[in-house]
Amino acid sequence: MAVTACQGLGFVVSLIGIAGIIAATCMDQWSTQDLYNNPVTAVFNYQGLWRSCVRESSGFTECRGYFTLLGLPAMLQAVRALMIVGIVLGAIGLLVSIFALKCIRIGSMEDSAKANMTLTSGIMFIVSGLCAIAGVSVFANMLVTNFWMSTANMYTGMGGMVQTVQTRYTFGAALFVGWVAGGLTLIGGVMMCIACRGLAPEETNYKAVSYHASGHSVAYKPGGFKASTGFGSNTKNKKIYDGGARTEDEVQSYPSKHDYV
């Protein structure tokens, strides 16, 4: 039960994390105008990965996309790439983890297959979270560097716009969303990897024999327990017989064409 809970929780946490990474990537407020010296401003600037916006105090907001690709700074391109890779890996991880969930029965999928899928999705979530954290951190570093530049026409590193000295940019909401979302995805991935240990059946010395009532040839199977995936001791022994896989902690029992001895 603890394995199912850990796996389920890991999935939910990762799902929230990836949703957050997507939200952060789409948000316009990666950097916002620093209002430290002027808390009330008639014109408020903020910038995202894809466009820059200006909100006027009268209510009018205008956003302009970065319609150039080659003209953008390499760092911004790198951040975009990291966030997109994070989203793609996370999405694939979610897809894999759905099929790996212990509470979902798909045909006669063996527990070892579910364990492998859980581990795969866990690793994908971990890499996805790291990509998001790295992307946000690179952008934050750009902001910190640019913040202290005091040249009259300094280059912002965000969309190639000329910036006058009085407009400085600081961390926007998207950075915090990205950090938290990346962290959640990372935690979810770790939880999936931990759950994998509980799902993986362990090698034992027991022999399993299956008999068939009819007269045609019967297979004798030594070493009827599947090999462990190598994540240490397993609290549950999951016997896999020729007639289909059933775990001991399953509440519902299903009849089989084989008699178990």
Epitope: Q33, A42, V54, S58, F60, M161
Partner: antibody
Framework: QVQLQESGPGLVKPSETLSLTCTVS?????????WNWIRQPPGKGLEWIGY???????NYNPSLKSRVTISRDTSKNQFSLKLSSVTAADTAVYYC???????????WGQGTLVTVSS | DIVMTQSPDSLAVSLGERATINCKSS????????????LAWYQQKPGQPPKLLIY???TRESGVPDRFSGSGSGTDFTLTISSLQAEDVAVYYC?????????FGQGTKVEIK
């Protein structure tokens, strides 16, 4: 087309409070605009007094801030100006105006002359 | 506060001739985020409220004749009436909308010579 109409007393005694109301028609006061008060002393230039914006936030000219209050009544689609402790220097035509793109005043009321005199 | 200074104070121009009004601000009105200058021009005829002509220094308000044009950037701006008409006789004001408090120029009176 948004239309604005100022109303209020044309004569106010010194040290009293000047109260004006601007009624908005053809648009909602809760819409994404800022609702401003601007004044113009006779034969002189324009002076921005302050505004209340779409979210109810106010911003005032520092030279008048201690004496000014701008509020709104969304149910009546009106916004108001209160200027306390008036003197003869506050005699002016008071305009209400809507600002939007470029923080520019796109719609204006006809203005109302307020004279401060005993 | 940003101080707006207009020149000249008054201007007499023949019908059909070009009229040019200058406006200078004490600080730059250029916003780096959208590369727009937060300056507007208004026309005020006697007994009437001001009417918006130009915003963002050079964008003409809808319904304003194309003989009115705005130019300039940073601290120096110009309103040009390419061919003065009788109905253009008025006082013209510039206004900065970049920093609080929003301020107006003292006005330029345009008359027919």
């Amino acid at each position: 087309q948004v239309q604005l109409q100022e109303s209020g007393p044309g004569l106010v005694k010194p040290s009293e409070t000047l109260s004006l109301t601007c009624t908005v028609s053809g648009g909602s006061i809760s819409s994404n605009y800022a609702w401003n008060w601007i004044r113009q002393p006779p034969g002189k230039g324009l002076e921005w007094i302050g505004y209340i914006n779409y979210s109810g936030n106010t911003n005032y000219n520092p030279s008048l801030k201690s004496r000014v209050t701008i509020s709104r009544d969304t149910s009546k689609n009106q916004f108001s100006l209160k200027l306390s402790s008036v003197t003869a220097a506050d005699t002016a035509v008071y305009y209400c105006a809507t600002s939007y793109y470029g923080n520019s005043f796109i719609y204006w009321g006809q203005g109302t002359l307020v004279t401060v005199s005993s | 506060d940003i101080v707006m200074t207009q020149s000249p104070d008054s201007l007499a121009v023949s019908l059909g001739e070009r009229a040019t009004i200058n406006c200078k601000s004490s600080q730059s009105l250029l916003n780096s985020g959208n590369q727009k200058n937060y300056l507007a021009w208004y026309q005020q005829k006697p007994g009437q409220p001001p009417k918006l002509l130009i915003y963002w220094a050079s964008t003409r308000e809808s319904g304003v004749p194309d003989r009115f044009s705005g130019s300039g950037s940073g601290t120096d701006f110009t309103l040009t009436i390419s061919s003065l008409q009788a109905e253009d006789v008025a006082v013209y004001y510039c206004q900065q909308a970049y920093s609080f408090p929003w301020t107006f120029g003292q006005g330029t009176k345009v008359e027919i010579k």
